[in-house]
């Protein structure tokens, strides 16, 4: 005969937090470690599952195809209910009836998703939205891979993504002193560096590299390098290219300079010679297929030239240099030095020997060029 369960037989309600799509195990333990009758019901008293003889039986609930129990643990008095592929609407109070006791478990299922694609361009905004059961009042705290903490309620917004935001975001949802952790992988589509400067002596080969800060299985898009030479009044397109399945193919290249581009990633360009007329700054843009906006990397070229003309030894640099850079001319193994925070230095009637032209930043040499000054003999006076 069915015994009535009194109020004192009703154990304190437990709260369990679950994640949408995950599996949860709601525990229910009998005092005696033996197989006995048990039932799991929802708040509407609809049977979900239970035991009939030695067999697991399922009721007419919506959970019937996703609910199960660990039969191997029944002999130990453990009558847990496992719910697979959790849905927000699975949030409910579940009752386990065993040994004339009722154990209530409140299950709250949460979901946290990115509103858009998780592959976002640098500077774009990321919004994370929390799905939660009616009546709940959760709080959310997210930590970026770089250690940035952001708090919110039903939505969390990161207005401008930076390249260091790439990686796994860990978000903790709290409700009734319980927590559930979500991990969301965010890929910030950007170049590894926002800007880079190449320092070269006149005539040297120049290499520009544009490594990406992410990897994708299939990478398709198109790009262009615009160049603003210091000596030119306007910028010009140096090269345009396509990127298909990580293979680079050049579409159009300027005739001067004659650039070469690598066909593999990372994007790589070679300029045969560093010349003063090429010194300046460029902007490489990459538009990725199915993404709005473009990736950008700035690249600067600084060119040095040391020349001797008649009695004048000159060292010059062209290109974007900061005012704090020092340009100096010094005679090897001698104290003679001329230094200036300028783009040109010169020595009149230089001593014979090996002169060094140095471009330095706080003592660190960025670029050097050597020039040999040969002794000049006075021209004999014609009789």
């Amino acid at each position: 005969e069915q015994k009535l369960i009194s109020e004192e037989d009703l154990a304190a309600k437990k709260v369990v937090l679950g994640k949408k799509g995950d599996t949860v195990e709601l525990t229910c333990n009998a005092s005696q470690k033996k197989n006995t009758q048990f039932h799991w019901k929802n708040s509407n008293q609809i049977k979900i599952l239970g035991i009939q003889g030695l067999f697991l039986t399922k009721g007419p609930s919506k959970l019937s195809d996703r609910a199960d129990s660990r039969k191997s643990l029944w002999d130990q008095g453990c009558f847990s209910m496992i719910i697979k592929n959790l849905k927000i609407e699975d949030s409910d109070t579940y009752i386990c009836e065993v040994e004339n006791k009722k154990e209530e478990v409140e299950l709250l299922v949460f979901g946290l998703t990115a509103n858009s694609d998780t592959h976002l361009l640098e500077g774009q905004s990321l919004t994370l939205t929390l799905e939660s059961p009616p009546g709940s009042s959760p709080s959310v705290k997210c930590r970026s891979p770089g250690g940035k903490n952001i708090q919110g309620g039903r939505t969390i917004s990161v207005p401008q993504l930076e390249r260091q935001d790439s990686g796994t975001w860990t978000c903790t949802v709290s409700q009734d002193q319980k927590t559930v952790e979500f991990k969301i992988d965010i890929v910030v589509l950007a170049f590894q560096k926002a800007s880079s400067t190449v320092y070269k002596k006149e005539g040297e080969q120049v290499e520009f590299s544009f490594p990406l800060a992410f990897t994708l299985e299939k990478l398709t898009g198109s790009g262009e390098l615009w160049w603003q030479a210091e000596r030119a009044s306007s910028s010009k397109s140096w090269i345009t290219f396509d990127l298909k399945n990580k293979e680079v193919s050049v579409k159009r290249v300027t005739q001067d300079p004659k650039l070469q581009m690598g066909k593999k990633l990372p994007l790589h360009l070679t300029l045969p010679q560093a010349l003063p007329q090429y010194a300046g700054s460029g902007n490489l843009t990459l538009a990725l297929e199915a993404k709005t906006g473009k990736l950008h990397q700035e690249v600067n070229l600084v060119v040095m030239r040391a020349t001797q003309f008649q009695e004048n030894l000159t060292c010059e640099v062209w290109g974007p240099t900061s005012p704090k850079l020092t340009l100096s001319l010094k005679l090897e193994n001698k104290g003679a030095t001329v230094s200036k925070q300028a783009k040109a230095v010169w020595v009149l009637n230089p001593e014979a020997g090996m002169w060094q032209c140095l471009l330095s930043d706080s003592g660190q040499v960025l670029l050097e060029s050597n020039i040999k000054v040969v002794p000049t003999w006075p021209t004999p006076v014609q009789p």
Epitope: Q205, E207, K244, N245, E247, S249, V250, Q260, M261, G262, K263, K264, H268, T270, P272
Partner: antibody, heavy 118, light 107 residues
Framework: EVQLLESGGGLVQPGGSLRLSCAAS????????MSWVRQAPGKGLEWVST????????YYADSVKGRFTISRDNSKNTLYLQMNSLRAEDTAVYYC???????????WGKGTTVTVSS | AIQMTQSPSSLSASVGDRVTITCRAS??????LGWCQQKPGKAPKFLIY???TLQSGVPSRFSGSGYGTDFTLTISSLQPEDFATYYC?????????FGQGTKVEIK
């Protein structure tokens, strides 16, 4: 085992045409770039042409541009080289090659000989 | 087009010798360089890609190094089956170009 088997070589008169085939097996043909490389008698290796994977970009050596056409039939796992306006200097052993994921020619066929002579 | 210059064009060596072949590119090609081996009457066999990565199945006595314009193929201890012609190949961009080859002969 990855295998490439060339066919279609032979003797042809200057100005004539030939179509070389390369049957591929042992790998997912459509996902790799494929190339043709040739070697004239007693000479070194010369790259002729490359066709990228299923996107189909094609590249040619200046010496064959406008005369040779590379193509592929992914459903038949076959690479082709259509050679028109053949010249004596096109006489060579033609090798079919497969590129690896890093776009290097990692597997080579045994080659097929093309002789252009009157 | 990028020119690839191999040296020497031929060399004589004995079994057990350490052999070094160099390849120079006319411009910087990063590490986009491969090496292959060809025996008389046979198809070339790929040995090394990305300047230093050994193709699977290639004996560890073969090694490659270099970046930019200067590259080296080294055979640490020459074996009888290593007597062949070796070619370097730039894979930086099109047109792909080979070195003229280095013939390794028995001394």
């Amino acid at each position: 085992e990855v295998q490439l088997l060339e066919s279609g070589g032979g003797l042809v008169q200057p100005g004539g045409s030939l179509r070389l085939s390369c049957a591929a097996s042992g790998f997912t043909f459509s996902t790799y770039a494929m190339s043709w490389v040739r070697q004239a008698p007693g000479k070194g290796l010369e790259w002729v042409s490359t066709i990228s994977d299923n996107i189909g970009n094609t590249y040619y050596a200046d010496s064959v541009k406008g005369r040779f056409t590379i193509s592929r039939d992914n459903s038949k796992n076959t690479l082709y080289l259509q050679m028109n306006s053949l010249r004596a200097e096109d006489t060579a052993v033609y090798y079919c090659t497969k590129d690896n994921e890093d776009y290097y020619m990692d597997v080579w066929g045994k080659g097929t000989t093309v002789t252009v002579s009157s | 087009a990028i020119q690839m210059t191999q040296s020497p064009s031929s060399l004589s060596a004995s079994v057990g010798d350490r052999v070094t072949i160099t390849c120079r590119a006319s411009q910087g090609i990063r590490n986009d360089l491969g090496w292959c081996q060809q025996k008389p009457g046979k198809a070339p066999k790929f040995l090394i890609y990305a300047a230093s990565t050994l193709q699977s199945g290639v004996p560890s006595r073969f090694s490659g190094s270099g970046y930019g314009t200067d590259f080296t193929l080294t055979i640490s201890s020459l074996q009888p089956e290593d007597f062949a012609t070796y070619y370097c190949l730039q894979d930086y961009n099109y047109p792909r170009t080979f070195g003229q080859g280095t013939k390794v002969e028995i001394k």
